[in-house]
Interface confidence: low
């Protein structure tokens, strides 16, 4: 790299160019501006999502009423931007509307106090009350004929209800992406409700949307946690690494610009500014497609799609091929006599360039590993650039990377071997035991949910060749461990979880991996009721039955944290046999009652409970 380029980049970073594509002329009325940009249908959908993500307990009808009122008001502002209140900020307009809800105090308790505050504190207050695990009933899927009738009777209400139910359960769901899911949801019903076998057509599509939706929600939750808990710099570092892997032919200046714009989009969505977020995301997709020649050769197909599909496609696009003959990194970042000079002149630009250069050469590394390497490089320069002989001090910095790279490689190798040996269910069980012993204070439902998701890394990533395993596995684990972190933050019970979640975003996974059995844990009192099962288990789906068994396994470990793998396996095998036997019995309930007592007694004996 020519260091003339480096100096020119300093000017670039203070220029308007780096501030992205989103410098708009000031609008008299922000609400009119967004209504015109987005169109009525998207405007209404996004306001509904925003309201449902803030007031997660409000009935559907109340939200629809509020959305209609906001929409009518927006239309008056489109007609006359100088009309009364049209000059107010969106936060003010939306916050005022939310604060008209009559039952705010009864339903939300202290959240009602937010309404006594002025903007921007009021919006911050609403954001702080978003609940990652709201006390809402599980969504039960009605019969296919019932759903198709509802869809045909009132398509608009049916689709709004989908947006509402997803948004209130996932208060950080990426709003423009939820519009894309709703579009696919509508397409599934349009096609399948006319099919000969409606269920065969529809159910797999709904299952796919549900699973993809959960994954999308969790990925976005990590982005919001990154921004909110660790700041914009942490998110930008993540984005530099990921976009450099995806667009290795793009210049650093181009990547930096995309990072700036992407950061703005996600900051807005995570901050509840959903209209601005969706509008800016559309602009970013437009910019990327207009400049694809200087970004990536893989964007052509994406850029031919309609807006929602286009944005989704760009977000998921495969990595472009690496440019041939990229020079060694050592020349610019270790051997050059100007390393400390360039670092001192613009630390974040220099580190950004390091991260860009490293990431574009390593699509085989996870983003979090690349960030650990950049952090190690930064720490070394901080120390060495103050030393008597800086070059001598940092000359071996790349040697420090080796163990950092080997650790996730070894971990993935070991766990993929274990997964291949056990299969997904038993691999999940191994992780359940492992994590319950590490953090036994965490609630059983959270341990089951998180360990089941951790266990899915096997089927998701172990099938990949070596070069794709680490980015798949470790970046997925970051998403799952963030679920643990946000659930635990709501009701903190373990100092160890708090420590791993808050100390370093990129070292969360190594921190959890390093946790050993919690020797301070006082085993839970034995409660026979926890291990009492009834005939209803026989009618459950395979997945729900697994969850029941895994819940029992966690409780078992909480009672007997020092139980060996062999002991636990024996008890779980007995338990599986017991369920199978009683589900085949004529009098199932009696079988569960009598055989259950025997099983509990035998388990107590086997484990010394």
């Amino acid at each position: 790299m020519k260091w003339v380029t480096f100096i020119s980049l300093l000017f670039l970073f203070s220029s308007a160019y780096s501030r992205g594509v989103f410098r708009r002329d000031a609008h008299k009325s922000e609400v009119a501006h967004r209504f015109k940009d987005l169109g009525e249908e998207n405007f209404k959908a996004l306001v509904l999502i925003a309201f449902a993500q803030y007031l997660q307990q409000c009935p559907f009808e109340d939200h629809v009423k509020l959305v209609n009122e906001v929409t009518e008001f927006a239309k008056t502002c489109v007609a006359d931007e100088s009309a009364e209140n049209c000059d107010k900020s969106l936060h003010t307009l939306f916050g005022d509307k939310l604060c008209t809800v009559a039952t705010l105090r009864e339903t939300y308790g202290e959240m009602a106090d937010c309404c006594a505050k002025q903007e921007p504190e009021r919006n911050e207050c609403f954001l702080q009350h978003k609940d990652d695990n709201p006390n809402l009933p599980r969504l039960v899927r009605p019969e296919v004929d019932v759903m198709c009738t509802a869809f045909h009777d009132n398509e608009e209400t049916f689709l709004k209800k989908y947006l509402y139910e997803i948004a209130r359960r996932h208060p950080y769901f990426y709003a423009p992406e939820l519009l894309f899911f709703a579009k696919r949801y509508k397409a599934a019903f349009t096609e399948c409700c006319q099919a000969a076998d409606k269920a065969a057509c529809l159910l797999p599509k709904l299952d796919e949307l549900r699973d993809e939706g959960k994954a999308s929600s969790a990925k976005q939750r990590l982005k919001c946690a990154s921004l909110q808990k660790f700041g914009e710099r942490a998110f930008k570092a993540w984005a530099v690494a990921r976009l450099s892997q995806r667009f290795p032919k793009a210049e650093f200046a181009e990547v930096s610009k995309l990072v700036t714009d992407l950061t703005k989009v996600h900051t807005e969505c995570c901050h509840g500014d959903l209209l601005e977020c969706a509008d800016d995301r559309a602009d970013l997709a437009k910019y990327i497609c207009e400049n694809q020649d200087s970004i990536s050769s893989k964007l052509k197909e994406c850029c031919e799609k309609p807006l929602l599909e286009k944005s989704h496609c760009i977000a998921e696009v495969e990595n472009d091929e690496m440019p041939a003959d990229l020079p060694s990194l050592a020349a610019d970042f270790v051997e050059s006599k100007d390393v400390c000079k360039n670092y001192a002149e613009a630390k974040d630009v220099f580190l950004g360039m390091f991260l860009y250069e490293y990431a574009r050469r390593h699509p085989d590394y996870s983003v979090v590993l690349l960030l650990r390497l950049a952090k190690t490089y930064e720490t070394t320069l901080e120390k060495c650039c103050a030393a008597a002989d800086p070059h001598e001090c940092y000359a071996k910095v790349f040697d420090e990377f080796k163990p950092l790279v080997e650790e996730p490689q070894n971990l993935i190798k070991q766990n993929c071997e274990l997964f291949e040996q056990l299969g997904e269910y038993k691999f999940q069980n191994a992780l359940l035991v492992r994590y319950t012993k590490k953090v036994p204070q965490v609630s059983t439902p959270t341990l089951v949910e998180v360990s089941r998701n951790l266990g899915k890394v096997g089927s998701k990533c172990c099938k990949h060749p070596e070069a794709k395993r680490m980015p798949c596995a470790e970046d997925y684990l970051s998403v799952v461990l963030n679920q643990l972190c946000v659930l635990h933050e709501k009701t903190p019970v373990s100092d160890r979880v708090t420590k791993c979640c808050t100390e370093s975003l990129v070292n969360r996974r190594p921190c959890f991996s390093a946790l050993e059995v919690d020797e301070t844990y006082v085993p839970k009192e034995f409660n026979a009721e926890t291990f009492t099962f009834h005939a209803d288990i026989c009618t459950l789906s395979e997945k729900e039955r697994q969850i029941k068994k895994q819940t029992a396994l966690v409780e078992l470990v909480k009672h007997k944290p020092k139980a060996t793998k062999e002991q636990l396996k024996a008890v779980m095998d007995d338990f599986a046999a017991f369920v199978e036997k009683c589900c085949k019995a004529d009098d199932k309930e009696t079988c569960f009652a009598e055989e259950g007592k025997k099983l509990v007694a035998a388990s107590q004996a086997a484990l010394g409970l």
């Epitope: 650990r372 190690t376 420090e400 990377f401 080796k402 163990p403 950092l404 650790e407 070894n410 971990l411 070991q414 070292n507 190594p510 921190c511 991996s513 390093a514 050993e516």
Partner: nanobody
Framework: QVQLLESGGGLVQPGGSLRLSCAAS????????MGWVRQAPGKGLEWVSA????????YYADSVKGRFTISRDNSKNTLYLQMNSLRAEDTAVYYC????????????????WGQGTLVTVSS
Amino acid sequence: QVQLLESGGGLVQPGGSLRLSCAASGVKAINHTMGWVRQAPGKGLEWVSAIRTPDGSTYYADSVKGRFTISRDNSKNTLYLQMNSLRAEDTAVYYCASVGDNAGSSSPPFASWGQGTLVTVSS
């Protein structure tokens, strides 16, 4: 979880040498420090030596400085302790341990232990 298995202990004459090995398997943390701890008959635990990842810096108790050398082979997940000029007071069960990040303190929190290997120095 880290599993540690020591080997290489035995009976040796004063002034002799031994090389202890510790094979590590299971999940390892980035900043794990690996070390050796010993327990002489009827005595408490004594921290002997440790090596830090990722920078490879080493720590030694004053009683073994200049005589013992700690090293590790990351490709084999193995930790070593080369013990030269052995003395009678080095007789102890030697444990391999994975340590927290404050290996320099006098009583580090050993997160994971091996079963130990007995070293007897006697003529």
